[in-house]
Amino acid sequence: APSCPQNVNISGGTFTLSHGWAPGSLLTYSCPQGLYPSPASRLCKSSGQWQTPGATRSLSKAVCKPVRCPAPVSFENGIYTPRLGSYPVGGNVSFECEDGFILRGSPVRQCRPNGMWDGETAVCDNGAGHCPNPGISLGAVRTGFRFGHGDKVRYRCSSNLVLTGSSERECQGNGVWSGTEPICRQPYSYDFPEDVAPALGTSFSHMLGATNPTQKTKESLGRKIQIQRSGHLNLYLLLDCSQSVSENDFLIFKESASLMVDRIFSFEINVSVAIITFASEPKVLMSVLNDNSRDMTEVISSLENANYKDHENGTGTNTYAALNSVYLMMNNQMRLLGMETMAWQEIRHAIILLTDGKSNMGGSPKTAVDHIREILNINQKRNDYLDIYAIGVGKLDVDWRELNELGSKKDGERHAFILQDTKALHQVFEHMLDVSKLTDTICGVGNMSANASDQERTPWHVTIKPKSQETCRGALISDQWVLTAAHCFRDGNDHSLWRVNVGDPKSQWGKEFLIEKAVISPGFDVFAKKNQGILEFYGDDIALLKLAQKVKMSTHARPICLPCTMEANLALRRPQGSTCRDHENELLNKQSVPAHFVALNGSKLNINLKMGVEWTSCAEVVSQEKTMFPNLTDVREVVTDQFLCSGTQEDESPCKGESGGAVFLERRFRFFQVGLVSWGLYNPCLGSADKNSRKRAPRSKVPPPRDFHINLFRMQPWLRQHLGDVLNFLPL
């Protein structure tokens, strides 16, 4: 077959080819930020000629053009400046209201490099209607100016802009407009991952929050974010595998779907996951009717087995057939469970469609969506039972209109997105499901998104101050108890002056709590082995502090999961009947276990906990420490089996002031405390300028750095004695 010519450069940009210069290969142009390619792509035809999708005239030279944002077409009851036909990247538009009207939304908006305005639609409202003035987004025209119950407004976009959101909205009895705000956007615009992740995540969390048959919510509360521990969710993942998706992109689709599956199983809800890949025909890799669809490892393995070559004989994009296979699955499940049963009616359904283009065969996908809505009996009362997320990737041949038509429309939520590339998709799925905003005491949740603060990443982390100076660190293990090190308390038992500083979303300095009660392990005595030539001994270096008040759970304050508890068992998704030994085997399951602790400046630092034979060689180094242990004959006199050991190779060493802080691991997007920082042979902070400066030990240092952490699996009897009525412990 002939190959296509190679004279396809774009001035100021680059291009990629999905299948080289061969027929069927898709050439995709990209430009630096703030510019967009025109045309966006070309397809190599079997004749050996390049064709530009959607183009009517002959092949023109590809160029990078400046991105612009749409201008307001009309702005009611106020004025905007400057008045331009469209706005350059970085350009601002400002809004002011006439007397008697109050500005809602953003008074100043800036054009972003993706062709989208930042902020929110500015509206001048006098509060006269049953519903608030729905406003007119930039570039849109609205018909309908009455905002009473039952009134409707319609929107269209000017010139060549594309409408996403609802083209028609109705003022509902609860004073809220139906559907979702319409936005007019340039056909070449796309969404930034940092905008999509929270939008998608909020909507998804809402939907998960509703996954609870016993929960009654007032309609006016909207869909409250509240992850519950019961109810059932069917999640259908649809992955486009058509010709225009390169094999590498398909791998990222798979990886993103795996992230999603991993994350969804980290929620404490019952979930079944279906996996469908599609091109000209759909292929069901996992059905919700299969019991394995409830098992994360099985779902992930069916995803891993998804093969790009499965669809090489039919390379079109048949989105209708993919959605129809979801409909058929639902139909079978309904027949199986019985149409009238609660078991069927209380299942929530979420469909995530990952595609890179418009459907080009099999009929309108909207028809399949209509069938799905019908079988699930979706009406205003049951609107929460179905969410369809349509995610276009690649901004080349993605059809905004089609995505918008497929995505659900819910007030204050978005369900249709276009991302620049598969890397952006991966980023979104990494950060979208953020449980950290929950107000209940769900444990071990940290915000992992790139723009989260240190305290949001490790919200269990607290600072302990005896007077003015910070001394030690600790970890919230419930809303009123902190776990820390005993050696922090060496002034007898007067803790009236001590304070515990806990994260607080309202203040970057946190919030101070008094200590109601300090429970210091009676076994701790730093001088216990002085007569054996062991000048400092840290066995039983553990303490619990009961705070004078309960901590309000937030993004900045939340307990970490303690292994061997039911709370941790749920987070690990382990079966009921699991034991403490099972948790130890799952969490400390290698010779070298990657773990973390929190530095003085709040950042998360990495260590490796040495287990088994590696523990022995890790601890052995202590014999070289002649000052603290002048005549040590047996290392185990100092490093008992109560300690975990780290500090080899590239590990960071904790500073003295980091004592008592959690040593923790991440599993399934949740965090588990396995130890607490106790003592070490090297202090990287000693004499430093401030909390941000740490010195690495010179390679020649004798003894080399080693750090020892109290192993919580070895402190179970003591923990159970004092926390038995606070946490639910598993059998040993």
Partner: nanobody
């Protein structure tokens, strides 16, 4: 907070010895890590040595290791710095410091003495 007063500084020849003392007021002395810092004219204040609240562990800057020894006597609320084999570059004002955590971060230290001058010169 602990009040600290240094003494023992003076003029000494290269190769000579000197013993600095730092006396602390306050019944909580035994709970604090104690340390010595020094500041040469026109230079930053730098860490010299520290001793743990137990007296069981000591730390030294590489530049003084093997020549200086830090010790404490909790019954006298005093910490000492024995300086041997003194060199011209040891010339500085020596400060005593108390720190509850043991990190001796310069930005956080609030218990300092007024300093004692050590001059090493022939």
């Amino acid at each position: 907070q602990v009040q600290l007063v240094e003494s023992g500084g003076g003029l000494v020849q290269p190769g000579g010895s000197l013993r600095l003392s730092c006396s602390a007021s306050g019944h909580t002395f035994r709970s604090y890590y104690m340390g010595w810092f020094r500041q040469a004219p026109g230079k930053e204040r730098e860490f010299v040595a520290s001793i743990s609240w137990t007296g069981g562990s000591t730390e030294y800057a590489d530049s003084v290791k093997g020549r200086f020894t830090i010790s404490r006597d909790n019954s006298k609320n005093t910490v000492y710095l024995q300086m041997n084999s003194l060199r011209a570059e040891d010339t500085a004002v020596y400060y005593c410091a108390a720190d509850y955590s043991g990190d001796f971060l310069l930005s956080d230290l609030d218990s300092w003495g007024q300093g004692t001058l050590v001059t090493v010169s022939s």
